[in-house]
C-alpha cells in the first residue's frame, strides 16, 4: 500500500513539475527591465526564451519573436536546449510511469517489469528536473554577469554614439516557476526510485516442497522457494518429527550445493 502511494504521489508531483517546466519555457517573463528614467513614458520591457515584449504605461503591449538564431547569445541557446531536453525527458518519463503504476493493470505485466519501468521513469524525472534547474540557473547567471558589465559598455558608432541604457534588471516570474517546477520534478523522480525498491520482487516467496536426503535420515519440509537464494534446506541434518510443518521464515536455512528437488 505504501509503495503504491509513494509511486502515485511521485507520479503526480512529477506531472505538476513537468507542467511547470513547460509553462516556464513558454513564459515571456524570464528577465524584466523597468525603464524608470525614460523621458517619454514608463516602459516595462520583458524577455522570454522565444520573444521580447514591451509594455507602456498607456497599456500598449507588443511582443516580437527572435526570428534569427545567429544573433542570439550562446547562453540563451543553451538554456533553450536544456529546457527542451527537460520537457522531452519528462514527457517520456510520464508515459513510461503511467504503464509502471501499480494501480493500473496491463495484461500480465509482472512486478519486476513494473519495477524497472518505475526506476526508468524516476531517473528520467530526476534528469528532467536537473535540466530545468540548470537551464534556469544558467539564465539567471547570464543576467547577473551581463548587467554588472553594462555600465562600462559605451562606444561611438558611425557619426553618433551607442551606449547601454541603465535599467533595473530583475529576475522574471518564469525563473521562479522553473526553479520550483524543476525541484518538484526532481522530488517526484526520487519518489519513483524509492517506490521501485518496494516493487522489486527481492524476497518473493513461492511455496514449494523441498526434499533433503542426507544419509538415512529424510526430512520433509514444506519450505519456501526463494527466487534469489535457491532452495531452502535443513542444513543441520536434524530430523523434523514434531509434525508442525514450518515455513522457511521459521527455520533459518542456508543454500547448499547438495540440495535438490
Amino acid at each position: 500500500m505504501a509503495v503504491t502511494a509513494c509511486q502515485g504521489l511521485g507520479f503526480v508531483v512529477s506531472l505538476i513539475g513537468i507542467a511547470g517546466i513547460i509553462a516556464a519555457t513558454c513564459m515571456d517573463q524570464w528577465s524584466t527591465q523597468d525603464l524608470y528614467n525614460n523621458p517619454v513614458t514608463a516602459v516595462f520591457n520583458y524577455q522570454g526564451l522565444w520573444r521580447s515584449c514591451v509594455r507602456e504605461s498607456s497599456g500598449f503591449t507588443e511582443c516580437r519573436g527572435y526570428f534569427t538564431l545567429l544573433g542570439l547569445p550562446a547562453m540563451l541557446q543553451a538554456v533553450r536546449a536544456l529546457m527542451i531536453v527537460g520537457i522531452v525527458l519528462g514527457a517520456i518519463g510520464l508515459l513510461v510511469s503511467i504503464f509502471a503504476l501499480k494501480c493500473i493493470r496491463i495484461g500480465s505485466m509482472e512486478d519486476s517489469a513494473k519495477a524497472n519501468m518505475t526506476l526508468t521513469s524516476g531517473i528520467m524525472f530526476i534528469v528532467s528536473g536537473l535540466c530545468a534547474i540548470a537551464g534556469v540557473s544558467v539564465f539567471a547567471n547570464m543576467l547577473v554577469t551581463n548587467f554588472w558589465m553594462s555600465t562600462a559598455n559605451m562606444y561611438t558608432g558611425m557619426g553618433g554614439m551607442v551606449q547601454t541604457v541603465q535599467t533595473r534588471y530583475t529576475f522574471g516570474a518564469a525563473l521562479f516557476v522553473g526553479w520550483v517546477a524543476g525541484g518538484l520534478t526532481l522530488i517526484g523522480g526520487v519518489m519513483m526510485c524509492i517506490a521501485c525498491r518496494g516493487l522489486a520482487p527481492e524476497e518473493t516467496n513461492y511455496k514449494a516442497v523441498s526434499y533433503h536426503a542426507s544419509g538415512h535420515s529424510v526430512a520433509y519440509k514444506p519450505g519456501g522457494f526463494k527466487a534469489s537464494t535457491g532452495f531452502g534446506s535443513n542444513t543441520k541434518n536434524k530430523k523434523i518429527y514434531d509434525g508442525g510443518a514450518r515455513t522457511e521464515d521459521e527455520v533459518q536455512s542456508y543454500p547448499s550445493k547438495h540440495d535438490y528437488v
Epitope: 516602459v43 524577455q47 507602456e56 498607456s58 527572435y66 551607442v162 551606449q163 535599467t167
Partner: nanobody, 121 residues
C-alpha cells in the same frame, strides 16, 4: 549595429516651417522610444519631443502647440514637424532611440550625429 541618420535641417526664416526626419538602420530588433533633443551653443542638451512605440508623446513646454512628433514603426523612422519657428529654436537637433538588442540582451541608447537648424532673418 544600429545607426541613426537625421535629415531636413537648414536655414529658415522666423515663423517658417521645417520637417526633420530620423531614420534608423542596421541590425534592428525593436526600437521602443525615440526622441528629438537639441543643443544650442553653450547650452545643455534638452529633450524637444519624444514618442513611444505605442504612440505616447511628450513635448518640452517651449515647443508645445508648435512642434509635432510622429513615427513610422514599420520603417523605423521618426519625424518632427516644426512650425512657427523662432530664433531661440536655433540649435543642433539630435535623434535618440532606445532599442532592445537580443544579441547582448541589453537596452541600447543610440544617438544620431545631428542636423543643424538655423532660424534667422
Amino acid at each position: 549595429q544600429v545607426q541613426l541618420v537625421e535629415s531636413g535641417g537648414g536655414l529658415v526664416q522666423p515663423g517658417g516651417s521645417l520637417r526633420l526626419s530620423c531614420a534608423a538602420s542596421g541590425n534592428i530588433f525593436r526600437i521602443d522610444t525615440m526622441g528629438w533633443y537639441r543643443q544650442a551653443p553653450g547650452k545643455q542638451r534638452e529633450l524637444v519631443a519624444g514618442i513611444s512605440r505605442g504612440g505616447t508623446t511628450t513635448y518640452a513646454h517651449s515647443v508645445k502647440e508648435r512642434f509635432t512628433i510622429s513615427r513610422d514603426n514599420a520603417k523605423n523612422t521618426m519625424y518632427l514637424q516644426m512650425n512657427s519657428l523662432k530664433s531661440e529654436d536655433t540649435a543642433g537637433y539630435y535623434c535618440n532611440a532606445q532599442a532592445w538588442d537580443p544579441g547582448t540582451f541589453r537596452y541600447l541608447e543610440v544617438w544620431g550625429q545631428g542636423t543643424l537648424v538655423t532660424v534667422s532673418a
